[in-house]
Amino acid sequence: MKVLQEPTCVSDYMSISTCEWKMNGPTNCSTELRLLYQLVFLLSEAHTCIPENNGGAGCVCHLLMDDVVSADNYTLDLWAGQQLLWKGSFKPSEHVKPRAPGNLTVHTNVSDTLLLTWSNPYPPDNYLYNHLTYAVNIWSENDPADFRIYNVTYLEPSLRIAASTLKSGISYRARVRAWAQCYNTTWSEWSPSTKWHNSYREPFEQ
């Protein structure tokens, strides 16, 4: 049994880091493998992650971490029984994938304005809370070409757009994702999408 693709990990910079790797053949990850991880810190204890299958030869493990900060560095040991298959390290702050924003809501009761709001996925005491920026994707269910991205570079988790920038009388969907420049993160996953019917009063032709 050998590791074909070494583990690569990303952290949500809060409580979970996800590591993925591939074996050289079909593997029952949860029964055959264990990923041991330990913070390089005074008094830290080793923890064991039981991986799940991610395709025939792929494995994924969700590492639980407390109080993630920039200084943290973890040792990783991948075991198959008594055999050490791979040894490495992981610094969560250098591989951050933020949590996806939630609770995306489209408020259509403001006159001729669409207000989209969503929730910051981090608590106020997490460093990323004040450092997320967002991308909002709006698309038409009827017209695949009607697809647009709005970059939200301010901290407030909301976006205002004129309803007239979208076509009237058809349904749209929106979703939002986040990233943080300070840690050069990847983009988060998209939030679940939300749907609304866009309608507004056309201005009278002269």
Epitope: D66, S70, A71
Partner: antibody, heavy 116, light 111 residues
Framework: QVQLVQSGAEVKKPGASVKVSCKAS????????MHWARQAPGQGLEWMGI????????SYAQKFQGRVTMTRDTSTSTVYMELSSLRSEDTAVYYC?????????WGKGTLVTVSS | QSVLTQPPSVSAAPGQKVTISCSGG????????VSWYQQLPGTAPKLLIY???KRPSGIPDRFSGSKSGTSATLAITGLQTGDEADYYC????????????FGTGTKLTVL
């Protein structure tokens, strides 16, 4: 919100021991390390040691090895610092502080006076 | 006695900028992260800066930290009378006796 509530002031005779408590609330007690530091009157901060509330393991500053004992009670989310063989130089305010590489939250401090 | 050296005192007028230095070595600041603590008279220390230059929520952006080599600096702009306090730097000893260190402390007086 996070609170670290320390026990009240103590007056001790030289050679005696003192046990200071620090009750934590507002967070997952076993998820954060707890440090102890002290500050003699008019002096700076001095680190004493650290305890991992999860397993109870400890590490102490060399200066206090053999004289200090840090323990925890997970049922009450309380950590304790006991200092033995007290001398007058141990007169100080003793602080518990939550954190790992840096200390996020501090207790208000417990004044321990050692006097004959 | 601390191996992190700070000036015993600094002073400046309200509205001015002041900097406090913290000098260490390769086995501490040079190889670790720096934090700063503010201790107002008669109170417990409070975390002001961590991870060299990050502020906890609630700390105004008048306070900033930086690190270069084996030294670190705390800068306070727009000085206010309420900033009068003792300031301590902190880091880790990364040699064999791995443990936290505090600086000698600096008394800031707002004139």
């Amino acid at each position: 919100q996070v609170q670290l509530v320390q026990s009240g002031a103590e007056v001790k005779k030289p050679g005696a021991s003192v046990k200071v408590s620090c009750k934590a609330s507002g967070y997952a007690f076993t998820s954060y390390y707890m440090h102890w530091a002290r500050q003699a009157p008019g002096q700076g901060l001095e680190w004493m040691g650290i305890i991992n509330p999860s397993g109870g393991s400890t590490s102490y500053a060399q200066k206090f090895q053999g004289r200090v004992t840090m323990t925890r009670d997970t049922s009450t989310s309380t950590v304790y610092m006991e200092l033995s063989s007290l001398r007058s130089e141990d007169t100080a305010v003793y602080y518990c502080a939550r954190g790992k590489w840096w200390l996020y939250n501090w207790g208000k401090g417990t004044l321990v006076t050692v006097s004959s | 006695q601390s191996v992190l050296t700070q000036p015993p005192s600094v002073s400046a007028a309200p509205g001015q900028k002041v900097t406090i230095s913290c000098s260490g070595g390769s086995s501490n600041i040079g190889n670790s992260y720096v934090s700063w603590y503010q201790q107002l008279p008669g109170t417990a220390p409070k975390l002001l800066i961590y991870d060299n230059n990050k502020r906890p929520s609630g700390i105004p952006d008048r306070f900033s930290g930086s690190k270069s080599g084996t030294s670190a600096t705390l800068a306070i702009t727009g000085l206010q009378t309420g900033d009068e306090a003792d300031y301590y730097c902190g880091t880790w000893d990364t040699s064999t006796h791995r443990h936290p260190l505090f600086g000698t402390g600096t008394k800031l007086t707002v004139l």
